[in-house]
């Protein structure tokens, strides 16, 4: 049986997700992120809420957070651009673009991920991959190496049931099932990848993990294509 990675997943194949980023605060993993262009990482706006006095950096090319790896490199952040409509008390518009101090050195372990521009819902039941260095069990253990899990997309109507997220899931958000397998604390800002394309970003709300009645919530990147393009331009 799975030994509780991400929640209910497993250790990722090293460097098989070259788009994966660790957004770090004062040298410690804070949130996930995804390289969407040579000099830009997409993450979640809420991740930087408490980072006012700290040093924010982005780690690329990593599998282990602690061990030396030839592909690993820590980049300073030149500019942090949260979505203008993001707010501390809601999960809406929970996107953040981080401009690296320089273009990332690309290679087999560092490569941008194509992101979805067609604003159409992913079909319910589609298996999507979510990865991160977030907690891996209900004790709160944090892993050193990247973890991942495959999750089926959940239709919005089910996700919006009163027993689930009670109408909070707008058309700009999507859900994935959370029955024991789930993204969790520390995975926020990381990528939800369907068919090799970035479809969603893990939101950073205060959701209970691994409870099937509280599905994972992801910001649909296609719904924010215009904003992403305007910042990257």
């Amino acid at each position: 049986p799975p030994r509780g990675r991400i929640l209910g997943g497993r250790e990722a194949e090293a460097h098989a997700r070259p788009y994966m980023a660790s957004v770090q605060l004062n040298g410690a993993h804070l949130c996930g992120g995804v390289l969407v262009a040579e000099q830009w990482v997409l993450s979640a706006a809420h991740c930087l809420e408490d980072a006012a006095d700290g040093k924010v950096q982005v780690l690329l090319g990593a599998h282990s957070l602690s061990q030396p790896e030839p592909s690993k490199r820590l980049y300073d952040v030149l500019r942090a651009v949260p979505h203008p409509d993001s707010q501390p008390d809601t999960i809406d518009h929970d996107l953040l673009l981080l401009q690296l101090s320089e273009k990332a050195t690309l290679g087999p372990a560092v490569r941008p991920l194509p992101w979805q521009r067609v604003d159409r819902d992913v079909a319910p039941g589609t298996l999507c991959d979510v990865a991160g260095w977030g907690i891996v069990n209900h004790a709160g253990r944090r892993p050193d190496s990247l973890q991942h899990v495959l999750l089926p997309v959940l239709d919005r109507a089910t996700c919006n049931r009163r027993t689930h997220h009670d109408g909070a899931i707008t058309e700009r958000l999507m859900c994935a099932e959370s029955n024991r397998r789930d993204s969790c604390k520390g995975d926020s800002g990381g990528p939800l990848v369907c068919g090799g394309v970035l479809e969603g970003v893990v939101t950073s709300g205060s959701r209970v993990c691994g409870n099937r009645k509280k599905p994972g919530i992801y910001t649909r990147v296609a719904s924010y294509a215009a904003w992403i393009d305007s910042v990257l331009a």
């Epitope: 509780g4 709160g140 253990r141 209970v208």
Partner: antibody
Framework: EVQLQQSGAELVKPGASVKLSCTAS????????MHWVMQRPEQGLEWIGK????????EFDPKFQGKATITADTSSNTAYLQLTSLTSEDTAVYYC??????WGQGTSVTVSS | QIVLTQSPAIMSASPGEKVTMTCSAG?????MYWYQQKPGSSPRVLIY???NLASGVPVRFSGSGSGTSYSLTISRMEAEDAATYYC?????????FGGGTKLEIK
């Protein structure tokens, strides 16, 4: 070095309440879960509950529901356990722990008239 | 809630001897933690997620198991291993402990 410093021993009367503290150093309590564990004299360990200090979400073993309250103050990097309506059955050592990997030294609570 | 039964409750072993203790779950769990506690001290985690050795724990300790049956093994008993050992499951809320196995040195 990660450390959890717990408050000192308590001698309290039956029916009273007590609030224990657990102050963390060298890590941010918001990054993981903080748990409280009870150990009665010469007995085993019992999980009381946990808190996610980032948002205040808590989870308790049902048998401690109504007896225990767990809170956290992220500005002081401290977790708290409050116990109410104390009886002799609550006489125990109470441990705080970060994600079950680092543990405080324990706080002894004695309930006696 | 899931009841964890540890056996034996008390055991003794000579230095250098192999020691195995078990933790039986009332229903299936996905993974197990093991802790060591010496008198007057706080518990310390030995094994997480069934078989992973915690930082700083000697390699003579190992964990294994699945479903309802889990075990902790000490490949060669040392005097400093005399302690009480607890299992705990992190699969199903509430997250229960076993009653403990007290290991003494012969």
């Amino acid at each position: 070095e990660v450390q959890l410093q717990q408050s000192g021993a308590e001698l309290v009367k039956p029916g009273a309440s007590v609030k224990l503290s657990c102050t963390a150093s060298d890590f941010n309590i918001k990054d993981t879960y903080m748990h409280w564990v009870m150990q009665r004299p010469e007995q085993g360990l019992e999980w009381i509950g946990k808190i996610d200090p980032a948002n205040g979400n808590t989870e308790f073993d049902p048998k401690f529901q109504g007896k225990a309250t767990i809170t956290a103050d992220t500005s002081s990097n401290t977790a708290y356990l409050q116990l109410t309506s104390l009886t002799s059955e609550d006489t125990a050592v109470y441990y705080c722990t970060r994600a079950m990997d680092y543990w405080g030294q324990g706080t002894s609570v004695t309930v006696s008239s | 809630q899931i009841v964890l039964t540890q056996s034996p409750a008390i055991m003794s072993a000579s230095p250098g001897e192999k020691v195995t203790m078990t933790c039986s779950a009332g229903s299936s769990v996905s993974y197990m933690y093991w802790y060591q506690q010496k008198p007057g001290s706080s518990p310390r985690v030995l094994i997480y997620d069934t078989s992973n050795l915690a930082s700083g724990v000697p390699v003579r300790f190992s964990g294994s198991g699945s479903g309802t049956s889990y075990s902790l093994t000490i490949s060669r008993m040392e005097a400093e291993d005399a302690a009480t050992y607890y299992c705990q499951q992190w699969s199903n809320y509430p997250y229960t402990f076993g009653g403990g196995t007290k290991l003494e040195i012969k």
